[in-house]
């Protein structure tokens, strides 16, 4: 019985002349992957990754298809003709064959740059807004604490008791209050043996992810 599922990068877009990583991942099965085939829209072969024989790249694509990362494939020097469906076929033992689909849209450089011109300031503004909100919340929290401590101070002033000030200590461990936790530029180990353009491409890809994750702000607030 085939219990596994293929997870793919789904619908992706990339710039003409640029590169893109096609990734499929087989999960929910203990089956052994013996071979992965990569095919193009018209079902013509792009590459094969055999567990024992390594990679076979279709000769016509040898200069612009790079094996990896992992069982994935990196398409370089993209043209408009590269737009379309891509299929990964996993041969496994004992399950049999699994198949995944990815749709790649190659955008004209001008279109991509045009959308980027609007996107970057927008993302920048959003990030700035989040930073401002973070700071505002910190200020409110600090002021509230100060007010509270002043009240306590005035009530206990007759007793001449000194405040420990512990509540105002900022935990230094994970990150300072209000800091926006950024994702790592590239997951550890992913570029271990992968070097050169592919790896640079990976870093670019994950830098985009980390840029998008700027919105996750962590606050250290009192509980109780």
């Amino acid at each position: 019985m085939m219990t596994g599922t293929i997870e793919t990068t789904g619908n992706i877009s990339a710039k003409k002349g640029g590169s893109v990583i096609l990734q499929c991942h087989l999960s929910s099965t203990m089956a052994q992957v013996t071979q992965v085939n990569w095919e193009q829209h018209d079902h013509s072969l792009l590459a094969i990754r055999n567990a024992e024989l390594g990679w076979h790249i279709y000769p016509a694509f040898k200069d612009r298809v790079a094996p990896g990362p992992g069982l994935g494939l990196t398409l370089q020097s993209l043209t408009m003709n590269d737009t379309g469906e891509y299929f990964c076929t996993y041969h496994t033992y004992p399950d049999g064959t699994y198949r995944g689909r990815i749709f790649l849209e190659v955008l004209e450089s001008s279109v991509a740059e045009h959308s980027a011109r609007f996107q970057i300031p927008l993302l920048g503004a959003m990030a700035m807004m989040l930073v401002v909100i973070c700071i505002a919340v910190i200020v409110v929290v600090v002021l509230a604490r100060k007010k509270k401590s002043l009240r306590i101070h005035s009530v206990e002033s007759g007793l001449q008791r000194k405040s420990t000030g512990q509540e105002e200590q900022i935990p230094s461990a994970p990150s300072p209050p209000g800091s926006c936790v950024q994702a790592e530029a590239a997951p550890a180990g992913l570029c271990g043996e992968q070097q050169g353009d592919d790896c640079a491409e990976l870093h670019d890809y994950f830098n985009v992810l980390s840029y998008r994750s700027l919105g996750s702000c962590s606050f250290f607030t009192e509980t109780g």
């Epitope: 072969l45 055999n50 024989l53 076979h56 200069d63 064959t97």
Partner: antibody, heavy 119, light 107 residues
Framework: QVQLVQSGAEVKKPGASVKVSCKAS????????MYWVRQAPGQGLEWIAF????????TYAQKFQGKATLTVDTSISTAYMELSRLRSDDTAVYYC????????????WGQGTLVTVSS | DIQMTQSPSSLSASVGDRVTITCRPS??????LSWYQQKPGKAPKLLIY???SLPSGVPSRFSGSGSGTDFTLTISSLQPEDFATYYC?????????FGQGTKVEIK
């Protein structure tokens, strides 16, 4: 048209080494892998190894690991196979063959090189 | 290792006959099988790849079929130049292995 021309016959003594060459023409050398197969007199075909002419990486049959060494010189579109520690049972015709477009099969073959190991 | 068992090891046939050679791998190789023809004193020549695909220049009387662990090479109408030895080969793992060969002789 695609052509693979191999070096001439060799006679070697046991324990010696031999280097067979395979000159390719009629296609872009670095786009294909080069395979080596041998055939002992009156016997069937036996795969030895292949080399990716683009990266220079080789894959060997376990039996020939440490026995055969594959190299390429892309500047002259030539593949080489060196066999070391020759024994009499290494006497065979050695073929180079260009890999196929769609996988690890052998699309075009050289004419073969007879290597005779005899004391 | 994947063992390739070819049958028959030899056969006698006449010009015009339909000839069938089978190849049985010891395990599932999907459609990763090729067929070669070798004439005495000559290098082998590719006839079929990926179980059923014909390279350009190979006559259409040659055809391949099968998948998994059962494959067939068929010569629909045997010609004088077809008398030779035929080998199957899997291309699904290391080592790549060949069948022991089938010699097609004139009856």
């Amino acid at each position: 048209q695609v052509q693979l021309v191999q070096s001439g016959a060799e006679v070697k003594k046991p324990g010696a080494s031999v280097k067979v060459s395979c000159k390719a023409s009629g296609y872009t050398f670095t786009r294909y892998s080069m395979y080596w197969v041998r055939q002992a007199p009156g016997q069937g075909l036996e795969w030895i190894a292949f080399i990716d002419a683009y990266s220079g990486g080789s894959t060997y049959a376990q039996k020939f690991q440490g026995k055969a060494t594959l190299t390429v010189d892309t500047s002259i579109s030539t593949a080489y196979m060196e066999l070391s520690r020759l024994r009499s049972d290494d006497t065979a015709v050695y073929y180079c063959a260009r890999g196929g477009d769609y996988g690890w099969y052998l699309g075009v073959w050289g004419q073969g090189t007879l290597v005779t190991v005899s004391s | 290792d994947i063992q390739m068992t070819q049958s028959p090891s030899s056969l006698s046939a006449s010009v015009g006959d339909r000839v069938t050679i089978t190849c049985r791998p010891s395990e599932n190789i999907y459609t990763y099988l090729s067929w070669y023809q070798q004439k005495p004193g000559k290098a082998p020549k590719l006839l079929i790849y990926n179980a059923k695909s014909l390279p350009s220049g190979v006559p259409s009387r040659f055809s391949g079929s099968g998948s998994g662990t059962d494959f067939t090479l068929t010569i629909s109408s045997l010609q004088p130049e077809d008398f030779a030895t035929y080998y199957c080969q899997h291309h699904y793992g290391n080592p790549l292995t060949f069948g022991q060969g089938t010699k097609v002789e004139i009856k």
